[in-house]
Amino acid sequence: SGTTNTVAAYNLTWKSTNFKTILEWEPKPVNQVYTVQISTKSGDWKSKCFYTTDTECDLTDEIVKDVKQTYLARVFSYPAGNVESTGSAGEPLYENSPEFTPYLETNLGQPTIQSFEQVGTKVNVTVEDERTLVRRNNTFLSLRDVFGKDLIYTLYYWKSSSSGKKTAKTHTNEFLIDVDKGENYCFSVQAVIPSRKVNRKSTDSPVECMGQEKGEFRE
């Protein structure tokens, strides 16, 4: 069904990292334009990206209203220059996205080691608490604010002179680990949500090593 010369969108895909959420689809339009709608299970559909020739639509502003809700988007196809035209059923051609629950599915962005500080045989490693686009009381929440204790960080650390890695875990953004005095260590961290079925882990942070400028050493 649908208007002659318009084709339905396909391969609707959610791309989401730290709640920055974009819907992508195909095909590149030829003589047609798209409008996107998004809704929770309430069926209160909100239109976005009106009559666009893009094949993506940033839906972040909608999903951050409640990241624990499940969303569905749909992409409508209209003939270019005749957006009032409808298909044989009296409705424009459209396709639904997969369901998307941001809290359960947004990818965890690559974390960053903010700092590390050595005091004697202990090193305190701090992970940057990345800001998200989720808002509460007009302020942007951090990843930790949103996920709370659901989010853990895993620290991988090793002596610069060897390849044997050790791991530590924290429910905060800080690690306190024991190190051998006089040895330089390298660190990498990974964000993890153990309770998830999918997208449980982020990619590893860039490696930071002692003796470089992020670190601080005190006897």
Epitope: A8, K41, S42, D44, E91, N96
Partner: antibody, heavy 118, light 107 residues
Amino acid sequence: EVQLLESGGGLVQPGGSLRLSCAASGFTFSNYAMSWVRQAPGKGLEWVSSISGSGDYTYYTDSVKGRFTISRDNSKNTLYLQMNSLRAEDTAVYYCARSPWGYYLDSWGQGTLVTVSS
Amino acid sequence: DIQMTQSPPSLSASAGDRVTITCRASQGISSRLAWYQQKPEKAPKSLIYAASSLQSGVPSRFSGSGSGTDFTLTISSLQPEDFATYYCQQYNSYPYTFGQGTKLEIK
């Protein structure tokens, strides 16, 4: 557990009115679109009406437009169907159902019988 | 309005059988189709949505397939509790419409 409990059915004369209610529990009512579906005796299912979670969007099958009004009170977790100018062909069991995105019907009540007869 | 045609209208089968019910839409509805089961004097129960997604709590012997205009509901190995009437429903566009039903009876 999702529970939907219809009430308000009964015997009414042609041209009369009835208001059906559906009390919902076990889920966040305002987060879901809701629908009414009916089934005439010995017949199949017929979608009647749907309403979005906010109540801002309503939809009706052609045969009831202008006669039936769907509404909801999210503070009372209750769905309504006001039926006016009833006809013999409106005789049916009326089911309320939860309707994610206003699409399919994932949970149903037990139904309430409306009989339109003189 | 979109017409939904189910076949067969009735079907006799035995426990353990593999059964397929078909539903055809009068125009393309992508995957916007649901299947329901109804037993006598009971409310319908949701089985499948989005043509092939199994509703939570529904046994895996039920499966759905199809897109566009032609859809099937398959029960891989009939159980005694599966004897009932089955309905398809399109939710592509209002007014939503159901098939006329397929009554599955014990042979």
